[in-house]
């Protein structure tokens, strides 16, 4: 009996430019003899329904149809037919199929590969054309993929134990596609600093599929107006 097992859940997520290993494990009732077996990896793009050969291994012959693609012969001996793809790109997302032949038996498995790019975030203060005591803070998120992103603004005053989401005077622009396929977006917060308590911390919070925890940039209103800080992971409400 020959069986192939892919990533649990049928989906693998990998960061852009990563050296990804797409898992494929072979289960066979007898010890594997790699000289008398074959492995072929196929890829089907998200946009075209056509399957393309990525890599093949037969006995003493192996060929990479995608530069750098490799299945380790040493690992194959112990049933690991995982495909390694260095420097994965956005356009390489899609369905990957691992086909194993141990004559006369054949088994296969498929997995969806999602390629994500994490946003970079920065905070800018724009006072051009603003009235006295009125400031516009811009939170720029760039280089992310996929397009879906959630940007919110939060504030925390000195006295209260938790932050609160700000919904008024927030404008988030449209996402803009970059040449490399990633996206950028800017969210703006308009503040009347004369109406806010010194010591209040404002924070731009970016949530995206590529992030385990939100990305944060914050600034604190001080008696002498404000101090901007570029933070991703610090004691953000200090």
């Amino acid at each position: 009996d020959l069986k192939v097992e892919m990533m649990a859940g049928g989906t693998q997520i990998t960061p852009l430019n990563d050296n990804v290993t797409i898992f494929c494990n072979i289960f066979y009732s007898q010890p594997l003899n790699i000289t008398s077996m074959g492995i072929t990896w196929f890829w089907k793009s998200l946009t075209f329904d056509k399957e393309v050969k990525v890599f093949e291994f037969f006995g003493d012959h192996q060929e990479a149809f995608r530069p750098g693609a490799i299945v380790s012969p040493w690992r194959l001996k112990s049933g690991d037919a995982s495909l390694r793809l260095p420097g994965i790109q956005l356009e390489e997302a899609g369905e990957y199929r691992c086909e194993v032949v141990v004559t006369p038996l054949k088994a296969q498995g498929t997995v969806q590969l999602e390629v994500v790019a994490s946003p970079a975030s920065r905070l800018l203060l724009d006072q051009v054309g603003m009235k006295e005591n009125e400031d516009k803070y811009m939170c720029e998120s760039s280089g992310f993929y996929p397009e879906a992103i959630n940007i919110t603004w939060e504030k925390q005053t000195q006295k209260f134990p938790h932050p609160i989401e700000i919904s008024e005077d927030v404008i988030t622009g449209p996402t803009i596609k970059n040449m490399d396929g990633t996206f950028n977006v800017t969210s703006c917060l308009k503040l009347n600093s004369s109406q806010e308590d010194p010591g209040t911390v404002y924070q731009c919070v970016v949530r995206h599929a590529s992030l385990h925890t939100p990305l944060r940039s914050n600034f604190t209103l001080t008696a002498a107006r404000h101090s901007l800080s570029e933070t991703e992971k610090t004691d953000n409400f200090s």
């Epitope: 000195q158 134990p161 938790h162």
Partner: antibody
Framework: QVQLVQSGAEVKKPGASVKVSCKAS????????MNWMRQAPGQGLEWMGG????????DYNEKFKGRVTMTVDTSTSTVYMELSSLRSEDTAVYYC??????????WGQGTLVTVSS | DIQMTQSPSSLSASVGDRVTITCKAS??????VAWYQQKPGKAPKSLIY???NRYDGVPSRFSGSGSGTDFTLTISSLQPEDFTTYYC?????????FGAGTKLEIK
Amino acid sequence: QVQLVQSGAEVKKPGASVKVSCKASGYTFTSYWMNWMRQAPGQGLEWMGGIYLSGDSTDYNEKFKGRVTMTVDTSTSTVYMELSSLRSEDTAVYYCTRRGDYFGDFWGQGTLVTVSS
Amino acid sequence: DIQMTQSPSSLSASVGDRVTITCKASQNVGKYVAWYQQKPGKAPKSLIYSASNRYDGVPSRFSGSGSGTDFTLTISSLQPEDFTTYYCQQYISYPLTFGAGTKLEIK
């Protein structure tokens, strides 16, 4: 990292006073507000009041006004909560708490005050 | 003072169950509601702020919703470590007030 370390358990007689301390470390002490909460055995949580750590502002729950005093010693980064005219229903665990960061607010480990004759 | 009425006061469930705890404020508190988990002998730990935002490190099975006067905490698939007590808190104004708590017990 931020730490709030409270003083040890106390046993008091009715009518006496108790002073619980909370020593803070790991952050700029004076730029924060510290709240005090309490929790009677098997009961819910109750806010008692708070103090700005520069020592220039306090806010007390009306229920405790006249009995509670919160003070700060900035030289040792310590906050104190004193409760007077103790009665049996003041038996509780007392907590100091500080506004949080992205992992939530910070709490001391709690101080059990037992009021018993 | 703003009263926070939490229900149920206790709840029996099994590992893997989906459970919902509700909290009703006596007046409009916007989204200024937090949820805490408290294990016996320990200080409360905050899970949710601003009604629906999870603090970092809090498992995704915990979610909050609501605004105005009605709020819920949902645990989508109970784990053994979730069987403890939960409190809601309003922080729109002083005095800060809490719900009376919901004790989650293993069925």
